[in-house]
């Protein structure tokens, strides 16, 4: 065991800060993009390097759920991820450099609201603080737009098709084709929160398919064709 | 006591890769950084990178960004770098070094020896 | 990318005596947080480098209080009173401000 082989830290006798918290009021991001909420502190215990958490919470200071939590090791660098919500949170300072900022990923328009920093040190130090305030993060909507659309081989020499789009609120899809009456059925499915897939699964005829991408912000559409030339199976798109 | 224990000398051909060992032992290895540092005979000391043991926080050198590739297995408190494309000039002794700051021990060093 | 810089390739010092070694950085090492991210090694002929101050003026665990580092936000001295014959080899110095971590060409102290 390490623990008894630990540096000394010279004593320094420049004047003590207090605790403080650094956030801005407001961060603003667009649902499905990334953002980074910034929090950077000062504290009294000048060469502190015993053992420290970083906590992010959401809702409330002091009593919200927690979305974020890391723990670092006396005389570490690395903060090591003992909670992110979802998978989606990520710590971006280093907290043994006074940086508690975060990023959050995916964003969704429910993850809206206010999110609190804390760091404690739970060693010899035993101290702790906490963001009273918080930052606010705005989530806006956003319009459809179509990530991929695709044309894969299916069974017996079958074609079928893929459109995936991503927006907030999730978009309707919807595919048009040559076949009989120009509009195809299509297996709407559920992607990952903001993102929602849509398969037609027999393209029957040669031609353009078109995949039409909408929520209450607009629409988006593209579109894949489809040649099979001398009965050979094989796409043009 | 902390202990990092390297893999043994190594000698490879031009355009070779090669696959190097850092094992820890005496402390809890998924607490701290390894870092990894080059130093060619009779020169002195250049920093490669260095990894956390979930291998997703990793950090390059841009220098040695093409040339090595840091890997971490928790399991058997083992850091590795794989140095690949090697040309004379990746002729060196490289370290491990890892604990408190990430640099209070050092590996004892691994001659990589680059020859047709 | 942070140059160091060690204008010393070497220091004759008699043993029982003091030297200085001095490094300087092309910016400040000085952090916001009041802390100056800069490291003293030696390297001791055939071995591995050995940590002796961390932060500019921290001795690490081990290392005898003959040592001692101090320095502004960019010149820094790392002195070593009472010369041992033990003392020889290379000393480094090294910033871990920012990425790329940056060694200085090293000082090599030899025994008079």
């Known amino acids: 065991d390490a623990s008894g082989d630990l540096l000394n830290t010279e004593a320094h006798s420049a004047p003590a800060q207090r605790w403080s918290m650094q956030v801005p009021a407001e961060v603003n991001a667009e649902a499905g993009d990334a953002a980074v909420l910034p929090c950077t502190f000062t504290h009294p215990h000048r060469h502190y390097d015993g053992p420290l958490t970083a906590i992010w919470r959401s809702g409330e200071p002091y009593a919200g759920p927690q979305v974020f939590r890391c723990t670092a090791a006396p005389g570490s660098e690395l903060c090591q991820t003992a909670l992110s919500l979802h998978g989606r949170f990520r710590l971006l300072g280093n907290p043994r450099r006074n940086d508690l900022s975060l990023r959050v990923e995916r964003l969704a328009l429910a993850d809206s609201g206010r999110y609190f920093c804390r760091v404690e040190f739970t060693g010899d130090a035993h101290d702790r603080y906490e963001s009273r305030h918080g930052v606010r993060l705005r989530v806006t909507a956003a319009a459809p737009r179509i990530v991929n659309i695709s044309v894969l081989p299916g069974p017996a020499h079958a074609f079928r098709a893929l459109c995936t789009a991503e927006g907030e609120p999730p978009p309707a899809l919807a595919w048009s084709g040559p076949a009989p009456g120009n509009s195809s059925a299509a297996l709407q499915g559920q992607g990952h929160g903001y993102q929602v897939t849509a398969e037609l699964p027999a393209l029957t005829r040669d031609g353009r398919y078109t995949c039409t991408a909408a929520n209450s912000l607009g629409r988006a559409e593209a579109s894949v064709y489809l040649f099979r030339f001398h009965g050979a199976p094989g796409t043009s798109t | 006591q902390v202990q990092l224990k390297q893999s043994g000398a190594e000698l490879v051909k031009p355009g070779a890769s090669v696959k190097i060992s850092c094992k820890a032992s005496?402390?809890?290895?998924?607490?701290?950084?390894v870092n990894w540092v080059k130093q060619r005979p009779g020169q002195g000391l250049e920093w490669i990178g260095k990894i956390g043991p979930e291998s997703v926080s990793i950090y390059y050198s841009e220098k040695f960004k093409a040339k090595a590739t840091l890997t971490a297995d928790k399991s058997s408190s083992t850091a590795y770098m794989q140095l690949s494309s090697l040309t004379s000039e990746d002729s060196a002794v490289y370290f491990c070094?890892?604990?408190?700051?990430?640099?209070?021990?050092w590996g004892q060093g691994t001659l990589v020896t680059v020859s047709a | 990318d942070i140059v160091m810089t060690q204008a010393a390739p070497s220091v004759p010092v008699t043993p029982g005596e003091s030297v200085s070694i001095s490094c300087r950085s092309s910016k400040s090492l000085l952090h916001s947080n009041g802390n100056t991210y800069l490291y003293w090694f030696l390297q001791r002929p055939g071995q591995s480098p050995q940590l002796l101050i961390y932060?500019?003026?921290n001795l690490a665990s081990g290392v005898p209080d003959r040592f001692g580092g101090s320095g502004s936000g960019t010149a820094f001295t790392l002195r070593i009173s009472r010369v041992e014959a033990e003392d020889v080899g290379v000393y480094y110095c090294m910033q871990h401000l920012e990425y790329p971590y940056t060694f200085g060409g090293g000082t090599k102290l030899e025994i008079k």
């Open positions: 932060r500019m003026s």
């Open positions: 070094a890892s604990y408190y700051y990430g640099f209070a021990y």
């Open positions: 005496g402390y809890t290895f998924t607490d701290y950084y």
